[in-house]
Interface confidence: low
């Protein structure tokens, strides 16, 4: 028999399971074709859908909430006590590994240190569903300047500034080898951007060149980075340089897969018991499963990748535990 439980009050926007260890789930999970409540009450009394199958929001036979196939091996199920709504931490699950998230523009940024000319760099960013970075605010530029783009243990010397291709070009408008000109956005689709200041200087140039490419130089000596020290250079587009890509934020699951709009997923981060819906590139309506303490183990560590799985650290204990609850099917 099921243990008595206190009177259940789910938050608005949540569905109350009739019984079982999971109590509250996000409302959109009701009648979505996947049973989430243990008693499957979220899929009961649903309106009939014409046609052979229910709409599954484009999902395959694998339930992205748990990453398991329906009717899969029950030993992979982890028992949970309660699924509670949580406020999702802003920095988790919005950018793939290696990309840095900035809330101000809902974008992800990544520096590529492989030297490429401007056009190859632009193509590389495009292949990654992004473009060479442009900036819409001073704050966005400051965020980029403040990042540690390579291995944190590396000690930076004075010359370890980053020279990065970014998404602007300098068009020469003056005649007779005058360097007067203007910055333009190099690629269409960059809306509401600010244009850089005049390039501090341009290196010796060929007489035929009338378009140069933007190189943002960030000085990465720790005491100087806090001064936002940087400079803008108009360089030959054929010079090889590191480059800065920018892409829209996106939902990223715990296995570093990009998740499409409307799908359920466990966000990248430090809580494998979190389940969310991807909406506008952000995890929304998240619920966190709470696990029972593993029996017969004093000291334990949670498995960072699997929900309700523990490593027992007791000298005489079994090493691996699943947290079993009495209501498990």
């Amino acid at each position: 028999t099921e243990p008595l439980r206190p009177e259940l009050r789910c938050n608005p926007g949540q569905f109350a399971c009739r019984s079982g260890t999971i109590q509250c789930i996000p409302l959109p999970w009701q009648c979505d074709g996947w049973a989430t409540c243990e008693d499957e009450s979220d899929e009961a009394n649903c309106p009939e859908v014409t046609g052979e199958v229910r709409p599954h929001h484009g999902k395959e036979a694998v339930d992205p909430r748990q990453g398991r196939a329906r009717g899969g091996d029950p030993s992979h199920f982890h028992a949970v006590n309660v699924a509670q709504p949580v406020r999702f931490s802003s920095f988790l699950g919005k950018c793939p590994t290696g990309w840095h998230h900035y809330e101000g523009t809902a974008s992800c940024y990544r520096v590529y240190l492989s030297g490429e000319n401007y056009w190859d760099a632009a193509q590389t960013c495009q292949r990654l569903n992004g473009s060479l970075a442009t900036f819409s605010t001073d704050q966005e530029l400051r965020f980029v300047l403040a990042q540690e783009w390579d291995q944190p243990e590396r000690s930076f010397g004075w010359k370890d500034q980053r020279k990065l291709w970014v998404g602007y070009q300098y068009v020469i408008t003056g005649r007779n080898r005058s360097l007067e000109g203007r910055w333009e956005v190099a690629f269409k689709g960059s809306s509401e951007v600010f244009l850089p200041p005049d390039p501090i200087f341009a290196s010796a140039m060929s007489e035929n060149d009338n378009v140069f490419c933007a190189q943002l130089q960030c000085f990465h000596f720790p005491t100087l980075r806090h001064h936002d020290l940087h400079s803008w250079h108009a360089e030959s587009c054929y010079e090889k340089s590191s480059f800065l890509c920018k892409r829209s934020q996106t939902c990223v699951d715990i296995k570093d897969n990009v998740v499409d709009e409307g799908f359920y997923f466990t966000p990248k981060g430090d809580d494998p018991c979190l389940s969310c819906t991807c909406h506008g590139g952000e995890p929304e309506m998240c619920v966190a499963a709470l696990c029972e303490r593993p029996q017969g183990c004093q000291q334990y560590r949670k498995d960072p990748k699997e929900c309700c799985k523990f490593m027992c650290l007791d000298p005489d204990g079994n090493s691996l535990f699943d947290s079993m609850a009495s209501g498990m099917r």
Epitope: W158, P197, D198, H227, D228, L229, S231
Partner: antibody
Framework: EVQLVESGGGLVQPGGSLRLSCAAS????????MSWVRQAPGKGLEWVSV???????YYADSVKGRFTISRDNAKNSLYLQMNSLRAEDTAVYYC?????????WGQGTLVTVSS | QAVLTQPPSLSVSPRQTVTITCSGD??????VSWYQQKPGQSPMLVIY???RRPSGVPERFSGSNSGNTATLTIGGTQAMDQADYYC?????????FGGGTKLTVL
Amino acid sequence: EVQLVESGGGLVQPGGSLRLSCAASGFTVSSNYMSWVRQAPGKGLEWVSVIYSGGSTYYADSVKGRFTISRDNAKNSLYLQMNSLRAEDTAVYYCARGWTTFDYWGQGTLVTVSS
Amino acid sequence: QAVLTQPPSLSVSPRQTVTITCSGDQLGDRYVSWYQQKPGQSPMLVIYQDDRRPSGVPERFSGSNSGNTATLTIGGTQAMDQADYYCQTWDNSPVVFGGGTKLTVL
């Protein structure tokens, strides 16, 4: 064409004040690092102060607390307010664009501090 | 604060190559710029970031920087190159100039 023109130099007594101006054309002062560099008669170059595009200001130890760098974006001009002047501040003062390197310089204005 | 040391004066015959040195502790870890200043004129940038030449500066000017020494080399020196030359770098001070080298073209 980029041009920097300094003015405001002259003879001043020790302890006195002077305000130097630097009118820029061909580029936007507020978008660039702008510095003052001085050169005492027959001596080498000495960096004095910088103002960043973001507005942060830095000074050489020798002038800290006495000199103030500023700019007027509407006039596209740079200024150096010099107070509590000393004999050792006597120099030609140049305004220059840049900070880690100076790619354009004005013609300079002579400041003489003497009683 | 960095201290940059230059030879006070050097002489060179026309069409010869001359090298002006600038030394400082671990200077090779920092970028160095070089300026030319003729009598009664403002300084002019001739080399930046160790070895890069701004547009308009003749190809006979070149630079390098490693270890504790940066060098400015003028190949095929001309009478018009007679001037004072200053090296410059930056650190937390933040800007430092060398004492200058008076180059005389004999």
